[in-house]
């Protein structure tokens, strides 16, 4: 029972984690304009892995994709690669783990095969989580470096009367989503690996034990794991949690005369 619960929980945690990694990768707010100790601008800048956006006080938001591949910083390319590898490994891991779940029967699949598949998916989840954490951390490091460089630039070259405000960027929401999601995927992977140990058949396999008592011969066959857990045949008491969250953008927009095409 504990093994199945561990496997099921590992799968769910990994599923949430991978969904988070996908969400983080797609999000535009990897870096957001630093508003602290900065003149109050009526324009808010934020950037993602795929495009940069500008939101005006009017509510008009313009996003521009990074249409160049060679012109992008190597670090950004590396982060993209890490996140994509994380998503791909996680997706494959999810696919494998579905078939490895103890509560799902596919033909006459042996427990040893399920154990191997559970271990494989667990390793994939661990690597996927590590890729996401590494990707987000590399981007965060890049931000910190650029932040202090731009801070230094803010106080230099101001001999003249005219000042140029340097836009500094700080951690965006996507970084935190990525870290949490990567951590969840990692934890899910570890749980799958733990479940794998419980799923693997014991080396000493007692097929049947005979007891001879008072002239009657009774053979006792130890029941398989399925018989003791209630999983396998009875799946009617599964609970499905369907949570939904809505967010509403509270920025102001402007009349139809300025509809952006």
């Amino acid at each position: 029972m504990a093994v199945t619960a561990c496997q099921g929980l590992g799968f769910v945690v990994s599923l949430i984690g991978i969904a988070g990694i996908i969400a983080a990768t797609c999000m535009d707010q990897w870096s957001t304009q630093d508003l602290y100790n900065n003149p109050v601008t009526a324009v808010f800048n934020y950037q993602g892995l795929w495009r940069s956006c500008v939101r005006e006080s009017s509510g008009f938001t313009e996003c521009r994709g990074y249409f160049t591949l060679l012109g992008l910083p190597a670090m950004l390319q590396a982060v993209r690669a890490l996140m994509i590898v994380g998503i791909v490994l996680g997706a494959i891991g999810l696919l494998v783990s579905i078939f490895a779940l103890k509560c799902i029967r596919i033909g006459s699949m042996e427990d040893s095969a399920k154990a191997n598949m559970t271990l494989t998916s667990g390793i994939m989840f661990i690597v996927s989580g590590l890729c996401a954490i590494a990707g987000v951390s590399v981007f965060a490091n890049m931000l910190v470096t650029n932040f202090w460089m731009s801070t230094a630039n803010m106080y230099t070259g101001m001999g003249g009367m005219v000042q140029t405000v340097q836009t500094r960027y700080t951690f965006g929401a996507a970084l935190f989503v990525g870290w949490v999601a990567g951590g969840l995927t990692l934890i899910g992977g570890v749980m799958m690996c733990i479940a794998c140990r419980g799923l693997a058949p014991e080396e000493t396999n007692y097929k049947a034990v005979s007891y001879h008592a008072s002239g009657h011969s009774v053979a006792y066959k130890p029941g398989g794991f399925k018989a003791s857990t209630g999983f396998g045949s009875n799946t009617k008491n599964k609970k499905i949690y369907d949570g939904g969250a809505r967010t509403e953008d509270e920025v102001q927009s402007y009349p139809s005369k300025h509809d952006y095409v």
Partner: antibody, heavy 118, light 113 residues
Amino acid sequence: QIQLVQSGSELKKPGESVKVSCKASGYTFTNYGMNWVRQAPGQGLEWMGWINTYTGESTYADGFTGRFVFSSDTSARTAYLQISSLKAEDTAVYFCATLGYGNSLAYWGQGTLVTVSS
Amino acid sequence: DIVMTQSPDFLAVSLGERATINCKSSQSLLNSGNQKNYLTWYQQKPGQPPKLLIYWASTRDSGVPDRFSGSGSGTDFTLTISSLQAEDVAVYYCQNAYFYPFTFGPGTKVDIK
């Protein structure tokens, strides 16, 4: 089409209060922020601030905090500018305007002349 | 606050001639995020509210004749009327639309010579 219609001229005594209204039509009122601009007789334009008509949050320019209050009534599709403890130097034409691309003031009301005289 | 200065204060140009108004801001109005300058130009005729002419320093608003053009970047901007018409007699204001508060320039009065 989009229109901003302001209340009529006001003649007030120093120390009194005035409430200028700006009724919007032709668009969803809560989607668009409302700005207020002052123009003293024969003078230039002075941006007073703006109100986010969705959240009700206001941003005031320096010199327009305290006596000046922006508000809005969603159901009436109207934005208000209230000035308390009026002074002679508050005599001006007050405009309401909505934001457009590039944070520009795209649509303007016709203006409301507030005269403060003893 | 950002200080906006305009030159000249008054400009008299013959009909059909070019009119050029300059505007300078105390800080750069260029946003690095989209490489756009948040500088707006307005036209105000006597007894009327101001009318939006140009936003993002060089983008004409819909319905604005193409004889009006804006240029410049950072702190120095220009509004050009390529061929002055009688209906162009007005006061022209530039405005910082990047930093709060949105400050206006003192205005340039354009008249016919």
